[in-house]
């Protein structure tokens, strides 16, 4: 009978194992090993026995010792299971973006390592197994399927094979895959919200404010605003999970018409858009022309005003007839006239908005001088020694100067309180003069004695 | 002046129906003319409008749905496919007017027909 | 655009008492809004014009204020032949897709 020692070995590949043959007979005609292996005898041996150092063992052996005694032929083998780890450890890249709530596939290529039996791949997150299966194939594919949350932004994802041997060999074997980290992205199904003029007047500046709500990581979104191919250039405020891109628009004669207002919020790799029609216009002030801005009275004055061929005019809130972008009216110029307002309204629909615009403009009514016995009484009388004020007004447009003067000299204090003397009797002669002429009047003054009392 | 809507009746749905509108007293040209309805259980909704010069506009549910023309003493209202979600009374309403103190026209609905009623069923 | 919000969207109020009715604006409407009284089988019949204009043949029982985007309607002395439904209008725009009316207020006499 031939016996080996060790029966069975677990060493590493390219390791070395010292194997002994004996025979069950004390003289054995004749004692060995067969082996492909590298095999070297150490010396001395003993009469029934060899011992044999194999080298360089790179797979699974099965060396046999023989031996010939007086009693018969017999044969042993050992068995050589040769361990390593496995060459590859690999987790297949994750996608750029995952959104949340879809499953996420994660996928591990493992090549090499025996003995299989004993090798385990694991994925994880972080450092917590979320599958362990046993490694078939070469290359051995394992793949788990894994909810993904909020929660998972940013979490490291690795593989790990375990190459168990215990207890034979006391060491547990490891290797892990490089990790790969997450990013998850949360884009609601709703649009944006879009709130801009919906109509917007040439070189004017109109505000435009696109926000959404719901966004993970709200950090990581970007927004688009354009206003036809006018891009704009958003200030964007960040919520907890919202966001909100404020700009200032401005547009210019060529862009006049309908033009499409676009806000786009992209996550990971998604986009949620909002379009919206913005009509461009351009309306200036009506125009209030009057055939002479400054007449003589008496004179006919045409007031016309005139506005956008849409637009509807109301000349001093009587609107045009038809209604329509033109209204005049003719009047003959009064004193009553003279600083008069003229206002022009007019009223424009665009895209089914109305939007207003006023133009103003005043009459100058040139008249007089004026002397009239309502303003410039023709005859005082005054008790003498009483407190009066002679009063005499002067009308006209330019304003006139006035003079009232006794024989030429003495000037009757208009407009000033003064005690009533003897002297202040007599005909005055008030004067009223403008560049549009002049006109006089007599004024007499009155003075009454104490005696007549 | 006055409005007075005409066409409303029973239909059955997809099938086109028109109402009309005919305006006295006053010049379409010079107006702006609304249709409104009333659904039963309903509030007023506001359909669309057709300026003096022919220009439409429409609710956002309407769109597509209704068409609005008109003549020059009349204002039609086409129903393009009608379910029976349409069943309702529709008036039509003058909506245009002007403030003499700010000088601005405005939408107002100052007169009203006495509405028709549409029936829509299979 | 320009949404109307109306409230409350019922009250019940007893005769002789007062009711308020208010509408928010989604913007400014400057003054241009309109009170409508709409009872079934009639057209509705305009009370109110310019935010505070009573119409022509209506009972100054009725009050409209407000300007740029709240307002309000008031009904003093109610009487039973003020139960209706109540709706506010904006004068400012009839774009596409225009919000016109209020969603409404039924009046309830008690």
């Known amino acids: 009978q031939t016996s080996v020692f060790p029966p069975e070995v677990i060493l590493p590949r390219g390791g070395s194992v010292k194997v002994n043959c004996s025979a069950s007979c004390d003289q054995p005609i004749s004692l060995g090993m067969e082996t492909p292996l590298p095999k070297k005898e150490i010396l001395p041996g003993g009469n029934n026995w060899k011992m044999y150092e194999l080298s360089n063992v790179q797979e699974d052996s099965q060396p046999m010792c023989y031996s010939n005694c007086p009693d018969g032929q017999s044969s042993a083998k050992t068995l050589l299971t040769v361990y390593w780890t496995p060459e590859r450890v690999e987790l297949a890249p994750l996608p750029p973006w995952q959104p949340v709530g879809k499953n996420l596939t994660l996928r591990c290529q493992v090549e090499g390592g025996a003995p299989r039996a004993n090798l385990t791949v694991m994925l994880l997150r972080g450092e917590k197994e979320l599958s362990r299966q046993s490694a078939v194939g070469e290359p051995a594919e394992v793949t788990t399927t894994v909810p993904v949350g909020r929660d998972d932004h940013g979490a490291n994802f690795s593989c790990r094979t375990e190459l168990d041997l215990r207890p034979y060999v006391l060491k547990l074997f490891e290797n892990t895959s490089a990790p790969h980290q997450l990013q998850t992205f949360d884009l609601p199904a709703t649009p944006p919200q879009l709130v801009s003029p919906q109509v917007l007047e040439v070189d004017t500046q109109g505000t435009v404010v696109c926000s959404l709500d719901g966004l993970f990581p709200v950090s990581e979104a970007q927004v688009s605003l354009a206003l036809g191919d006018q891009k704009l250039n958003p200030t964007i405020t960040y919520g907890n999970n919202s966001l909100s891109a404020k700009a200032s628009v401005k547009v210019t004669a060529e862009e006049e018409g309908t033009q499409q207002l676009l806000c786009g919020v992209m996550l990971g790799n998604q986009t949620q858009e909002t379009r919206q029609t913005v009509t461009i216009y351009s309306f200036p002030a009506p125009n209030v022309n009057l055939t002479k801005p400054e007449v003589s009275e008496g004179t006919e004055v045409i007031v016309e005003c005139e506005a956008h061929p849409r637009a509807k005019v109301m000349l001093n809130g009587v609107p045009a007839q038809p209604p329509g972008p033109r209204a005049q009216f003719l009047l003959k110029a009064t004193p009553e006239d003279n600083g008069r307002s003229f206002s022009c309204s007019a009223t424009l629909e665009v895209a089914g908005q109305l939007v207003h615009k006023n133009q103003t403009r005043e009459l100058r009514v040139l008249y007089g001088p004026r002397l009239d016995e309502k303003d410039c009484p023709g005859n005082w009388t005054w008790p003498e020694n009483s407190q009066q004020t002679p009063m005499c007004q002067a009308w006209g447009n330019p304003l006139p100067q006035l003079k009232c003067l006794k024989d030429g000299t003495f000037p009757l204090p208009i407009g000033q309180s003064v005690t009533v003397t003897r002297d202040l009797e007599g005909t005055y002669l008030c004067q009223a003069r403008s560049t549009r002429g002049e006109v006089t009047r007599e004024v007499t003054v009155n003075v009454l004695s104490p005696r007549y009392e | 002046q006055s409005v007075e809507e005409s066409g409303g009746r029973l239909v059955t749905p997809g099938t086109p129906l028109t109402l009309t509108c005919t305006a006295s007293?006053?010049?379409?040209?010079?107006?702006?003319m609304s249709w409104v309805r009333q659904a039963p259980g309903k509030g007023l909704e506001w359909i669309g409008i057709i300026s003096d010069s022919g220009s439409t506009y429409y609710a956002s549910w309407a769109k597509g749905r209704f068409t609005i023309s008109k003549t020059s003493t009349t204002v039609d209202l086409k129903i393009t496919s009608p379910t029976t979600e349409d069943t309702a009374t529709y008036f039509c309403?003058?909506?245009?007017?002007?403030?003499?103190?700010?000088?601005?026209?405005?939408?107002?609905?100052?007169?009203w027909g006495p509405g028709t009623l549409v029936t829509v069923s299979a | 655009g320009y949404d109307m919000t109306q409230t409350p969207a019922s009250v019940e109020v007893a005769v002789g008492g007062t009711v308020t009715i208010k509408c928010q604006a989604s913007?400014?409407?400057?003054?241009?809004l309109a009170w409508f009284q709409h009872k079934p089988g009639q057209p509705p019949k305009r009370l109110i014009y310019k935010a505070s204009t009573l119409a022509s043949g209506v009972s100054s029982r009725f009050k409209g204020s407000g300007s740029g985007t709240q307002f309000t309607l008031t009904i003093s002395g109610v009487e039973s032949a003020d139960a209706a439904t109540y709706y506010c209008q904006q004068g400012y725009s009839r774009s596409d897709g225009e919000h016109v009316f209020g969603g409404g207020t039924e009046v309830v006499v008690k």
């Open positions: 913007q400014s409407i400057n003054s241009w």
């Open positions: 309403a003058r909506d245009w007017s002007y403030d003499s103190s700010s000088g601005y026209y405005y939408y107002d609905m100052d007169l």
């Open positions: 007293g006053f010049s379409l040209s010079n107006y702006y």
